[in-house]
């Protein structure tokens, strides 16, 4: 059986939309599937790599690599999206291309970034971990770390940095899929909202879904002990 909840929820474009949340009900009137997984149920994607989930994550990453920051022209906010999902008339899509990106490092101004921009994250404004020396962030946003400390400046002069961010990574469903969503939408969908991250590639949703002890490598499920827990 399914339990359907419908509610008006604030979505990425800043408008309220009617959203359906479908929950698979437990036939025995007990915990939900997500709760059972958290409690240690035999759920194979938490024990070993699941090809289907792996391909979903790779597909999400490929899409994210090509994303940019969609900044609303009315200054109502910004969100990381694909160009096709960013209004050409109501918003500005900030994407580095044709030599408009910042240099990879101050030692070599000629080598420009082509991957980005990212809403609220920029190698020029992140102090920790700083993109410098032997630790230059790669020219692939899906390999960027989470910035834990921004430069102390209320205005950077960058469109994608000075806007109010409207969405962050949200881990939804037992498949460990990730979407950039508003907090409201994420909570309604019973997802896990990552306040600290800007990109889905910075979070490991399956690790969150499985719970218990974190994976040794967040990319590789290793909870073999589930076989004895349940």
């Amino acid at each position: 059986a399914q339990h359907v909840t419908t509610q008006l929820v604030l979505r990425n474009k800043g408008v309220y939309e009617s959203v359906k949340y479908i929950q698979q009900e437990n036939f025995w009137i007990g915990p939900s599937s997500i709760d059972l997984i958290h409690l240690g149920a035999k759920f194979s994607p938490c024990i070993r790599k699941d090809q289907q989930i792996e391909q979903l994550v790779l597909r999400e990453r490929d899409l994210e690599r090509d994303s940019g920051c969609c900044v609303q022209n009315d200054h109502s906010g910004c969100i990381q999206t694909q160009r096709k999902d960013c209004s050409e008339t109501l918003a500005t899509f900030v994407k580095w291309q044709d030599d408009t990106g910042p240099p990879m490092d101050k030692s070599d101004l000629g080598q420009k970034r082509t991957s980005g921009a990212v809403c609220h994250q920029d190698p020029r404004t992140c102090e920790e971990p700083a993109s410098s020396g032997a630790h230059i962030w790669p020219d692939d946003i899906t390999k960027w770390p989470i910035c834990t400390e921004q430069a102390k400046s209320n205005r950077t002069g960058f469109l994608h940095m000075d806007c109010q961010i409207k969405g962050r990574p949200c881990c939804i469903s037992t498949k460990g899929s990730c979407e950039i969503t508003t907090r409201e939408y994420c909570e309604f969908m019973h997802g896990y909202f990552h306040e600290e991250a800007t990109l889905c590639s910075q979070v490991h949703c399956l690790d969150k879904v499985c719970g218990l002890l974190p994976f040794l490598n967040p990319e590789v499920p290793d909870q073999f002990y589930r076989l004895w827990l349940s």
């Epitope: 101050k106 070599d108 101004l109 000629g110 020029r124």
Partner: antibody
Framework: QVTLRESGPALVKPTQTLTLTCTFS??????????VGWIRQPPGKALEWLAH???????YYNPALKSRLTISKDTSKNQVVLTITNMDPVDTATYYC????????????WGQGTLVTVSS | EIVMTQSPDFQSVTPKEKVTITCRAS??????LHWYQQKPDASPKLLIK???QSISGVPSRFSGSGSGTDFTLTINSLEAEDAATYFC?????????FGQGTKLEIK
């Protein structure tokens, strides 16, 4: 409010070494993404970038003059010092210090400049 | 090094006129170009960054455009206080280089 002020001799003799000091306020050179550098302008001519020093002590010099230039900073005193060896009459110019940022590698604040004449 | 060439070297214009100053780079520099204004006996002042982005406190009559090798600084409805020399600067690669300047005289 950001201010920069250059100081140094108004007159130097050929072959001598010029030492210029930039004293600034309103920001710290330990602040991430900031640098201070020197640009000169011979009378009635274009601007020429000489050197920059960054918050992390990275230094960059104009290759055409690199062998003659040395830039250093004293963060506690809010000062940047530039020395130019083997001065020549063609080095006669107004020398400016300016703040630079890695945000766009442009100079957002400048000092008023100091005119240095090289003559025997 | 990248050579920046401005034109014209000198321009005499009347107030309220629209003025355009061009800057050409010896190689493509994307949008990594900035404009400065230098009034007589004063230090340069940043007007425009990244070819077209305005700087706070700079009058809106100043605007920039262009990418690649050709850039333009436009002053809409010139005012007497705009009498100055205008320089472009590239930050595409070291060493940072400037144009030779365009002197604007008000008739």
């Amino acid at each position: 409010q950001v201010t920069l002020r250059e100081s140094g001799p108004a007159l130097v003799k050929p072959t001598q070494t010029l030492t210029l000091t930039c004293t600034f306020s309103g920001f710290s050179l330990s602040t991430f993404a900031l640098g201070v550098g020197w640009i000169r302008q011979p009378p009635g001519k274009a601007l020429e970038w000489l050197a920059h020093i960054w918050w992390d002590d990275d230094k960059y010099y104009n290759p055409a003059l690199k062998s003659r230039l040395t830039i250093s900073k004293d963060t506690s005193k809010n000062q940047v010092v530039l020395t130019i060896t083997n001065m020549d009459p063609v080095d006669t110019a107004t020398y400016y210090c300016a703040r630079i940022t890695t945000y766009y590698y442009g100079m957002d604040y400048w000092g008023q400049g100091t005119l240095v004449t090289v003559s025997s | 090094e990248i050579v920046m060439t401005q034109s014209p070297d000198f321009q005499s214009v009347t107030p309220k006129e629209k003025v355009t100053i061009t800057c050409r780079a010896s190689q493509s520099i994307g949008n990594h170009l900035h404009w400065y204004q230098q009034k007589p006996d004063a230090s340069p002042k940043l007007l425009i960054k990244y070819a077209s982005q305005s700087i706070s406190g700079v009058p809106s009559r100043f605007s920039g455009s262009g990418s690649g090798t050709d850039f333009t600084l436009t002053i809409n409805s010139l005012e007497a206080e705009d009498a100055a020399t205008y320089f472009c600067q590239q930050s595409y690669q070291w060493p940072l280089t400037f144009g030779q300047g365009t002197k604007l005289e008000i008739k």
